[in-house]
C-alpha cells in the first residue's frame, strides 16, 4: 500500500497522488498526430496516416485527443505558418499567430491553456514571411481527458506531417 | 555498483554518469548530440564532448544516428542562428533558415521529413539579428534506421553545446 | 488502495490525480514548474499551483531544481515575451532577449548552460511584439544537481502558466 | 476483483424515463471512468458514452446527446445512465463497463434489460 | 461515424479448426481495432486489443492481425467452449462503434 513503512513525510508524499496499476506494466500510451493537408482552412488532426499514430489507448474524439488512463504525459504541438508579402495597394496589417494546447475537463466549465505560443508578424512589401512555434511539457492528466489545439492564423499554416502536429506520450 | 562486473570500456561509461538501476536491466536507449563548434562551416555532430552521450545501442554513422531497436522514440533537435547587419554598400538579401530532422530507412528511397522548422530572415542596417528553432515529436522508428538533419543556413549557426543539438531517447 | 484508511482531506487530494502503478514502486521523477505571475520583475519558479507539481523527490530549491537520482532526465523550458511599441520620442533601442537553463553541480564550480535560445528584437513606432521560446534535451544528471534557469528580458515576460514554465522528467 | 453490478432496468412507456444504477467494486472507483454500453436483443453492440468519477468528465455517442446523461456519486461508487423520451428502439440489455486503458472495455457488469413499450 | 462490417456473419466448425474471421473499417483506423467474445445471455469479453495484443489471462490459441481497415481474428485451434458471437470493435474515434458480429458454431 502506498506509505506503508515509509517515513510520515514520506508517506504524505506517496499519498498526494495514488497511483493505477497496469497489468505487466507494459503499456505505454503514445499518440502523434499530424495536421490534414487536403483541408486548407481548418486543422483537422488525423492518425492514420504517414507517421502519425495513436497506441496503447490513446483515442480520437470530436478533434480531441482521449487520455487512456490517469498519469502524467509529455504533450506537444508544433505549428509552421508561411505568407506572402501584401500588395502595394493593400495596407499591411499585423497578423496574430498563435497556437495552444487545451485540456477539457468536466471539471472545468472552459478548456484550460495547457501551452501556449504567441507572435504577431508585420507583413512587408516584397517580403514573405516564415514562422515556426513549438511547445511541450509534462502534465498530470485524468482518463477521459480531452486533449485539443487552437490556432489563431489557420490559413496560414503550412500543413505538412513534418511542420504542423499535436502529439503526447506517458511517462 | 556502477561499473561493476563488466568490461572495462562498460565500467568506464557506466562510472562516467551514474545513473538509475532499473529492474531486470531494462535498456533505455537514449542520445545527444551537440555541433562541433570546431567545424564553422558544417554541422557535424559529436557524441564524445561536454554532456553529449549515446546510451544503451546509439550510435553514430555518417553524422546520421543509428535506430538501435524498434519501437517509439522522441526525437528532438534544436539550432540558433545569427547574423550581423549588412553593410550600407550591401544589398540586403532575404535569408531562408530552416533545420530539419530526416529519416532514412530501408523502407523508403529517399529520405522522410520528420520535423521541420523554416523561417525568413530580413537583416536590417545596423541591427544584428538571432533565431532560434526547436522541435521535437514522438515517431515509430525501426532498428537500423538512420536519423540525420539538414539545415538551410549553416554559415550562421551559433555553435555551442547548449544552443545546437540533437537528440532521441525510446519512450 | 488509494485513499483508504486517510483523513477526508488527504482522500480526497490522493483522488486528485490517480496515477499509474509500476512494478516494484518504480519511481519516475518529474517535475513542471511555472513562473509566478505575482512577481513581474523577476521570474520565480512555483509547483504548487495551477498544473504545477514535483513528483517522485524532485524539490524546489532557491528557485532551482534539485535532480533527484542520478539518470538521464528530459529538461525543457519556455518563456514568452511580450512588448509594445516605442514612443516617437523614445529612441527604439534593440532588445535582447535570451533564456537558458542551467546546471550547477558540484562537479563544475559554475552554472554550465544546458539549453538556451536566443532572439534580437527591433520595437517599432507603433507594433506590439511577442516572442516564444522554447527549448528541451535529455541530460546525464546526478543526484544532488541544480537545474536554474537565466533569462535576459525578464521586464517582458508573459507570465501565466501555459507560458512560462520550466521542467524535468526521468527516462 | 472488479466487480460492475447494473439496476434500475424494466418496462417504461414510450416518452417516459428511466435512471440506470452501475454499483462499482474491488478498485479505487476515481482512478477509472464508466461506461455505459447497450444491446437491442439479438442485435450488436453500442457505445453510449462515459463518465469519470474523479472529474465528472464526459463523452457521449452523438446519437445519445440530449436524450442520456451519465453521471456517478464518489460517495457511493455508483455510476448512473439517466434515460429521458425513451423510444421502442431503445429496447435493449445495457451494460456498463470499466475500462483498463479508456477505449478498451475490459470489464463489464452483467446488463439490465430495458423494455421500452406501451 | 466508422463502419464496422464482419465477415462471415456465422461459421460453422469443428473442433480443433483454424478460424478465421475478418473486420473491414469504413476508414482506415491504424491499428486501433480490438476483439470481444460473447456467450448468450452473457457480457462480452475482451480478447484482443490495439489489433493484435491479447489480453491479460486470454489463451494464446486467439490471435490478431491487422492494421488500415482489414483486420482479423484467428482461433488457432477451435477449443469447445470457443463457440460464440465474436465482435470487433475500432477504438480509433469515438464514436467507438462495433461490427454486427460473428456467430461460430459447432458443425
Known amino acids: 500500500l502506498p506509505g506503508v513503512g515509509l517515513t510520515p513525510s514520506a508517506a504524505q508524499t506517496a499519498r498526494q497522488h495514488p497511483k493505477m496499476h497496469l497489468a505487466h506494466s507494459t503499456l505505454k500510451p503514445a499518440a502523434h498526430l499530424i495536421g490534414d493537408p487536403s483541408k486548407q482552412n481548418s486543422l483537422l488532426w488525423r492518425a492514420n496516416t504517414d507517421r502519425a499514430f495513436l497506441q496503447d489507448g490513446f483515442s480520437l474524439s470530436n478533434n480531441s485527443l482521449l487520455v487512456p488512463t490517469s498519469g502524467i504525459y509529455f504533450v506537444y504541438s508544433q505549428v509552421v505558418f508561411s505568407g506572402k508579402a501584401y500588395s502595394p495597394k493593400a495596407t499591411s496589417s499585423p497578423l496574430y499567430l498563435a497556437h495552444e494546447v487545451q485540456l477539457f475537463s468536466s471539471q472545468y466549465p472552459f478548456h484550460v491553456p495547457l501551452l501556449s505560443s504567441q507572435k504577431m508578424v508585420y507583413p512587408g512589401l516584397q517580403e514573405p514571411w516564415l514562422h515556426s512555434m513549438y511547445h511541450g511539457a509534462a502534465f498530470q492528466l485524468t482518463q477521459g481527458d480531452q486533449l485539443s489545439t487552437h490556432t489563431d492564423g489557420i490559413p496560414h499554416l503550412v500543413l505538412s506531417p513534418s511542420t504542423v502536429f499535436f502529439g503526447a506520450f506517458a511517462l | 555498483l556502477p561499473g561493476v562486473g563488466l568490461t572495462p570500456s562498460a565500467a568506464q561509461t557506466a562510472r562516467q554518469h551514474p545513473k538509475m538501476h532499473l529492474a531486470h536491466s531494462t535498456l533505455k536507449p537514449a542520445a545527444h548530440l551537440i555541433g562541433d563548434p570546431s567545424k564553422q562551416n558544417s554541422l557535424l555532430w559529436r557524441a564524445n564532448t561536454d554532456r553529449a552521450f549515446l546510451q544503451d545501442g546509439f550510435s553514430l554513422s555518417n553524422n546520421s544516428l543509428l535506430v538501435p531497436t524498434s519501437g517509439i522514440y522522441f526525437v528532438y533537435s534544436q539550432v540558433v542562428f545569427s547574423g550581423k547587419a549588412y553593410s550600407p554598400k550591401a544589398t540586403s538579401s532575404p535569408l531562408y533558415l530552416a533545420h530539419e530532422v530526416q529519416l532514412f530507412s530501408s523502407q523508403y528511397p529517399f529520405h522522410v521529413p520528420l520535423l521541420s522548422s523554416q523561417k525568413m530572415v530580413y537583416p536590417g542596417l545596423q541591427e544584428p539579428w538571432l533565431h532560434s528553432m526547436y522541435h521535437g515529436a514522438a515517431f515509430q522508428l525501426t532498428q537500423g534506421d538512420q536519423l540525420s538533419t539538414h539545415t538551410d543556413g549553416i554559415p550562421h549557426l551559433v555553435l555551442s553545446p547548449s544552443t545546437v543539438f540533437f537528440g532521441a531517447f525510446a519512450l | 488502495l488509494p485513499g483508504v484508511g486517510l483523513t477526508p482531506s488527504a482522500a480526497q487530494t490522493a483522488r486528485q490525480h490517480p496515477k499509474m502503478h509500476l512494478a516494484h514502486s518504480t519511481l519516475k521523477p518529474a517535475a513542471h514548474l511555472i513562473g509566478d505571475p505575482s512577481k513581474q520583475n523577476s521570474l520565480l519558479w512555483r509547483a504548487n499551483t495551477d498544473r504545477a507539481f514535483l513528483q517522485d523527490g524532485f524539490s524546489l530549491s532557491n528557485n532551482s531544481l534539485l535532480v533527484p537520482t542520478s539518470g538521464i532526465y528530459f529538461v525543457y523550458s519556455q518563456v514568452v515575451f511580450s512588448g509594445k511599441a516605442y514612443s516617437p520620442k523614445a529612441t527604439s533601442s534593440p532588445l535582447y532577449l535570451a533564456h537558458e537553463v542551467q546546471l550547477f553541480s558540484s562537479q563544475y564550480p559554475f552554472h554550465v548552460p544546458l539549453l538556451s535560445s536566443q532572439k534580437m528584437v527591433y520595437p517599432g513606432l507603433q507594433e506590439p511584439w511577442l516572442h516564444s521560446m522554447y527549448h528541451g534535451a535529455a541530460f546525464q544528471l546526478t543526484q544532488g544537481d541544480q537545474l536554474s534557469t537565466h533569462t535576459d528580458g525578464i521586464p517582458h515576460l508573459v507570465l501565466s502558466p501555459s507560458t512560462v514554465f520550466f521542467g524535468a522528467f526521468a527516462l | 476483483e472488479v466487480q460492475l453490478v447494473e439496476s434500475g432496468g424494466g418496462l417504461v412507456q414510450p416518452g417516459g424515463s428511466l435512471r440506470l444504477s452501475c454499483a462499482a467494486s474491488?478498485?479505487?472507483?476515481?482512478?477509472?471512468?464508466i461506461h455505459w454500453v447497450r444491446q437491442a436483443p439479438g442485435k450488436g453492440l453500442e457505445w453510449v458514452g462515459y463518465?469519470?468519477?474523479?472529474?465528472?468528465?464526459?463523452n457521449y455517442n452523438e446519437k445519445f446527446k440530449g436524450r442520456f446523461t451519465i453521471s456517478s456519486d464518489k460517495s457511493k461508487n455508483t455510476a448512473y445512465l439517466q434515460m429521458n423520451s425513451l423510444r421502442a428502439e431503445d429496447t435493449a440489455v445495457y451494460y456498463c463497463?470499466?475500462?483498463?486503458?479508456?477505449?478498451?472495455?475490459?470489464?463489464w457488469g452483467q446488463g439490465t434489460l430495458v423494455t421500452v413499450s406501451s | 461515424d466508422i463502419q464496422m462490417t464482419q465477415s462471415p456473419s456465422s461459421l460453422s466448425a469443428s473442433v480443433g479448426d483454424r478460424v478465421t474471421i475478418t473486420c473491414r473499417a469504413s476508414?482506415?483506423?491504424?491499428?486501433?481495432v480490438a476483439w470481444y467474445q460473447q456467450k448468450p445471455g452473457k457480457a462480452p469479453k475482451l480478447l484482443i486489443y490495439?489489433?493484435?495484443h491479447r489480453y491479460t489471462g486470454v489463451p494464446s490459441r486467439f490471435s490478431g492481425s491487422g492494421s488500415g481497415t482489414d483486420f482479423t481474428l484467428t482461433i488457432s485451434s477451435l477449443q469447445p467452449e470457443d463457440f460464440a458471437t465474436y465482435y470487433c470493435?475500432?477504438?480509433?474515434?469515438?464514436?467507438?462503434?462495433f461490427g454486427q458480429g460473428t456467430k461460430v458454431e459447432i458443425k
Open positions: 470493435q475500432q477504438h480509433y474515434s469515438t464514436p467507438w462503434t
Open positions: 490495439s489489433a493484435s
Open positions: 463497463s470499466r475500462p483498463t486503458m479508456l477505449p478498451w472495455f475490459a470489464y
Open positions: 463518465n469519470n468519477p474523479y472529474n465528472d468528465g464526459t
Open positions: 474491488g478498485y479505487t472507483f476515481t482512478s477509472y471512468v
Open positions: 476508414q482506415a483506423v491504424s491499428s486501433a
